[in-house]
Every structure is written in C-alpha cells, then in structure tokens.
C-alpha cells in the first residue's frame, strides 16, 4: 500500500533571465527512494539515481543544475520555460510517486511564489 505523499513548491513564478529551484519532498513512507526523474511536459530533464548520482539531459546541460538535494535548479529562464514540471519518485517497495509544479516565467520584475501543496 502506498502511504507516502509528495510535497512540492506548488505554483511558482520567476523572472525571465533568472533562476528557480524546483523542489519535491516525499514523506509519510519508509520506502527507499531509488531514483528521482525530473520532466518538463514530455521531456526528460534530469535523473538522480541513488547509485549513479545525477544525469542531466545533454540538451539542458547549459541551463539545468542538479540540486539542492533531489531538487533541480533552472537557470537563464525564458518565457518558453513556462509550464508543468514533474518530479517522479521511484521507490522500493511502494512504487512510483509523482509531484507536479507549475512554473510561470514573467517578463516583469514581479514574481510571486505560490503556496506549498501536497499531492497524495
């Protein structure tokens, strides 16, 4: 039975040209996290594997940095970075947990962070 929940940074916004940290946290389970995949819509951005460490997709290497922790840092943001991001936690023995973050990249200097929320 999957008892865990994923807490994410929720709906967030950031300025064009700036950077943002995407964070997810798995709680309420003793399952072992074997790997976390980060996806942007239908693109694999990065993977953090418990044994192998980080792999950043080559096409994102210039603008994506691993961490902090299991999170992901997006740099040199453009308006095209606006959209959904997913953290996919592969765990044993529970299985897969998925969290969703919506990022809006703003032209203006006003960028508010949304409230944290949980996805069961």
């Amino acid at each position: 039975m999957m008892t865990g929940t994923i807490e994410t940074t929720g709906n967030i916004s950031a300025e064009k040209g700036g950077s943002i940290i995407l964070q997810c946290h798995l709680s309420s389970t003793t399952a072992q996290v074997t790997q976390v995949n980060w996806e942007q819509q239908d693109q694999l951005l990065a993977i953090c594997n418990a044994d192998l460490g980080w792999h950043i997709s080559p096409s994102f290497k210039d603008r994506v940095a691993p961490g902090p922790g299991l999170g992901l840092t997006l740099q040199s943001l453009t308006v095209n970075d606006t959209g959904e991001y997913f953290c996919i936690y592969h765990t044993y023995p529970d299985g897969t947990y998925t969290g969703r973050i919506f990022l809006e990249v703003l032209e203006s200097s006003v960028a508010e962070h949304g409230a944290r929320f949980q996805i069961p």
Partner: antibody, heavy 118, light 107 residues
Framework: EVQLLESGGGLVQPGGSLRLSCAAS????????MHWVRQAPGKGLEWVSS????????SYADSVKGRFTISRDNSKNTLYLQMNSLRAEDTAVYYC???????????WGQGTLVTVSS | DIQMTQSPSSLSASVGDRVTITCRAS??????LNWYQQKPGKAPKLLIY???SLQSGVPSRFSGSGSGTDFTLTISSLQPEDFATYYC?????????FGGGTKVEIK
C-alpha cells in the same frame, strides 16, 4: 572498458532447464540495473527480464513469468538467468545489457544461443 | 503493454542519402524512447537515448527527435557502415517493448 560476457547457452530438450550467466567487468556492477533481452532467429528484439542494482526488484515478460528467474551476485559481478520448463519458442540468442538510470541499454554482451529442440 | 510501431520495415538508400525512420507508441511515453543499431550476428548498439540524446561515441549524423507518441531517427548522410537494422525501444514502463525494426539496405 565495459565488458559483458554471456555463457551457458546450448541445446536443450523441451521441458529442460538452463542457467545463463553474464560476467561483467570494467564498471561498478553493483550500481547498475541489468536486463536480459532475447532475439529469436531472424526476428526482432524481445525484452525478457530485469533486476535492480541491489536485486531488490525484479520484473519479467509475461511469456517467461513463472519459468525464468533473474538473479545477480554483486560480489562476483555476475548476472544470471535460470530458465526452466523451456519451450521451442524460447529458442533465441540471449543478451545481457547494462541499464543506467533504468532508461537505456547502453552496453550489451555478445549473446549466447539457446536452442530448445527434441 | 505499450506497443511500438516502426516504419518503414525496410528501405533502400544510397550512400549520402538522408534517411528517416519513425516510431509510434500506443500511448504517451514522454521522452523514454531509445534507438539501437544492429548488424548481422552482432549485439545491438545504443545510438540515441531519451528520444534525442546522442550516445557517447556515436557519429553526429545520427539524431533523434519527438516526444509523447511520435519519434524519429534521422541519419543525415548515410555512410556504408550504416547499413543495418534499427530498433526503437520504450522504457516508460515494463514490460520494455521494441519496435519491429527497420532494415536499411543498399540501393
């Protein structure tokens, strides 16, 4: 240099058993998921089974479930496939492959031929 | 199970030609799509992983694109050593499944 070397193939009668081995070298074997893939003569590739780095998780194709068992010995850098109740349709070249991040099969062995025939 | 459909099943081309092979998944697989090259009597060789990432040591004339359900492998200028069979494979979910293969032959 990454190397995977399969062994244990051969001719076996229907209903018989074989154990395939895959000896790994040139990388930290215990950090990688490993898979078996087979290819019947003149046919395409068919995934058979996988095992996680610590051997905590295994998975099988429906066609072999209950008959084949994948295992590994990280102290010996070796992957195994125990094949029981073999059928004619199991005749194929069996490849072991290294699978970083459980996504792509980046190194393959040269394959070992299993022939099931009376 | 996710079905992978490759087309064409075979094609004839000349050295220097631009070759395109397509692969369609029966459901969305994000970018969990890999391409392999296999020559007769040899093991498959990884060319492209995660839809568009070029495996180390693979010539840059090979490229991959697509996401969701539709993917493409392109060889920009076919070389004599590229005549082989090419397979796509999804790793979105188990069982892992392969396309039926595309045999690239000399015209």
């Amino acid at each position: 240099e990454v190397q995977l070397l399969e062994s244990g193939g051969g001719l076996v009668q229907p209903g018989g058993s074989l154990r395939l081995s895959c000896a790994a070298s040139g990388f930290t074997f215990s950090s990688y998921s490993m898979h078996w893939v087979r290819q019947a003569p003149g046919k395409g590739l068919e995934w058979v089974s996988s095992i996680s780095s610590s051997a905590g998780y295994t998975s099988y194709a429906d066609s072999v479930k209950g008959r084949f068992t994948i295992s590994r010995d990280n102290s010996k850098n070796t992957l195994y496939l125990q094949m029981n109740s073999l059928r004619a349709e199991d005749t194929a070249v069996y490849y072991c492959a290294r699978v970083p991040y459980d996504v792509w099969l980046d190194y393959w062995g040269q394959g070992t031929l299993v022939t099931v025939s009376s | 199970d996710i079905q992978m459909t490759q087309s064409p099943s075979s094609l004839s081309a000349s050295v220097g030609d631009r070759v395109t092979i397509t692969c369609r998944a029966s459901q969305s697989i994000s970018s969990y799509l890999n391409w392999y090259q296999q020559k007769p009597g040899k093991a498959p060789k990884l060319l492209i992983y995660a839809a568009s990432s070029l495996q180390s040591g693979v010539p840059s004339r090979f490229s991959g694109s697509g996401s969701g359900t539709d993917f493409t492998l392109t060889i920009s200028s076919l070389q004599p050593e590229d005549f082989a069979t090419y397979y796509c494979q999804q790793s979105y979910s188990t069982p892992l499944t392969f396309g039926g293969g595309t045999k690239v032959e000399i015209k």
